[in-house]
């Protein structure tokens, strides 16, 4: 609704917040959440499982402002940082620093972005410049990806980059088409 106050070239109108889901209450800066893929069923043999769906991934909620040159978003956005190793769901610690990460012997499972959302942000600029609006790509969920020795270095490097920091915006994408999507679990005001 705050958009109405600006003489912008595009105006976004969001219905009353009560009508639509808000971000879950834990979406504050640097909170963590453990999330098990496929319902988090614990493996029958936790140290021998080879099914990626049996592994859980640590998601760090991160709140930041979007910047574009001297302009900054009017409101912070919340996205996920996919963090650390993946391990059997029931062996993962509930918080950073509590216990040690379980490392599978053999293939390496990495926590990487799975799904994104395109969120529109209003950018306020200094010096009387008119506000602008754009969409940014934000990480919405993470997954465990099995890496083997056959993965090349560039792929490993990309995973490391994705896991280490939040997405600033839009990154180069492979050319394949997306599969049919599932409903978003994370949604901000925009």
């Amino acid at each position: 609704q705050g958009w109405q106050a600006f003489k912008n070239d595009a105006t976004e109108i969001i219905p009353e917040l009560g009508e639509y889901p808000e971000p879950p209450p834990e979406l504050e800066n640097n909170k963590t959440m453990n999330r098990a893929e496929n319902g988090g069923r614990p493996p029958h043999h936790p140290f021998e499982t080879k099914d990626v769906s049996e592994y859980s991934c640590r998601e760090l909620h991160f709140t930041r402002y979007v910047t574009d040159g001297p302009c900054r978003s009017a409101k912070p956005v919340t996205e996920l940082v996919c963090s650390g190793q993946c391990g059997p769901a029931r062996l993962l610690p509930n918080a950073i620093g509590r216990g040690k990460w379980w490392r599978p012997s053999g293939p390496d499972f990495r926590c990487i972005p799975d799904r994104y959302r395109a969120q529109r942000v209003q950018l306020l600029c200094p010096g009387g410049e008119a506000p602008r609006a754009r969409k940014v790509r934000l990480v919405a969920s993470c997954k465990c990806k099995r890496l083997t020795r056959f993965h090349n270095q560039s792929e490993l490097k990309d995973f490391g980059t994705e896991a280490a920091r939040p997405q600033k915006g839009r990154k180069p994408r492979p050319r394949a088409r997306s599969a049919k999507a599932n409903q978003a679990e994370l949604e901000n005001a925009y």
Partner: antibody, heavy 125, light 111 residues
Framework: EVQLQQSGPELVKPGTSVKMSCKAS????????MNWVKQSHGKSLEWIGD????????TYNQKFKGKATLTVDKSSSTAYMQLNSLTSDDSAVYYC??????????????????WGQGTSVTVSS | DIVLTQSPASLTVSLGLRATISCKAS??????????MNWYQQKPGQPPKLLIY???NLESGIPARFSGNGSGTDFTLNIHPVEEEDAVTYYC?????????FGGGTKLEIK
């Protein structure tokens, strides 16, 4: 298969309004923004605005603010655009086109990758 | 608004040769390392069809004779080798900033 099926042509009188529809199928409706684009006869394309079916948020090109109203019906996976106070300048073909809201990393999320066939609107007395 | 200027407005190319269409933006459409320029093809009586997204990425199902490049404010669409069915209209479109805007179009003719 992704499909956007738009309603049929409209012949309307000046000063009235018209409401056209765009029924989506073949994908999860709430995972994509629905954009609306105007193409006047023999001319280029103009982005009218978009609506996010997930949360109902709408964004309008300032040029079309007050002229167009975007809505959705999630239960039928249908997007609607109403045009008000019609004049001859509103005679055009109007397209709906999706862009991605919730997606994996392998899509052209910042482009309109599927389009409806268009709804022709003729404003004449 | 970001203004996109396409040139030429019309272009005639011999069958099998290369067609190059230019699109210049009134300000940069780059953000965080990516360029937010898309290219569409429109045949008469049909809706536009996405060819290239993010300046250089070929959309799924589009023939490899279509390619795009550029960054900042200057972008090009290349078609090589040109085929008869390519004789239609092409539009560039920026998605870097609201409102999304389109170029004026380039009509390609084959001789």
């Amino acid at each position: 298969e992704v499909q956007l099926q738009q309603s049929g042509p409209e012949l309307v009188k000046p000063g009235t309004s018209v409401k056209m529809s765009c029924k989506a199928s073949g994908y999860t409706f709430t995972d994509c923004y629905m954009n609306w684009v105007k193409q006047s006869h023999g001319k280029s394309l103009e982005w009218i605005g978009d609506i996010n079916p997930f949360n109902g948020g709408t964004t309008y090109n300032q040029k079309f603010k007050g002229k167009a109203t975007l809505t959705v019906d999630k239960s039928s996976s249908t997007a609607y655009m109403q045009l008000n106070s019609l004049t001859s300048d509103d005679s055009a073909v109007y397209y709906c086109a999706r862009s991605h809201y919730y997606f994996d990393g392998r899509v052209p999320w910042d482009a309109m990758d599927y389009w409806g066939q268009g709804t022709s609107v003729t404003v004449s007395s | 608004d970001i203004v996109l200027t396409q040139s030429p407005a019309s272009l005639t190319v011999s069958l099998g040769l290369r067609a190059t269409i230019s699109c210049k933006a009134s300000q940069s459409v780059d953000y965080d390392g990516d360029s937010y320029m898309n290219w569409y093809q429109q045949k008469p009586g049909q809706p536009p069809k996405l060819l290239i997204y993010a300046a250089s990425n070929l959309e799924s199902g589009i023939p490899a004779r279509f390619s795009g490049n550029g960054s900042g404010t200057d972008f090009t669409l290349n078609i090589h080798p040109v085929e008869e069915e390519d004789a239609v209209t092409y539009y560039c479109q920026q998605s870097n900033e609201d409102p999304w805007t389109f170029g004026g179009g380039t009509k390609l003719e084959i001789k």
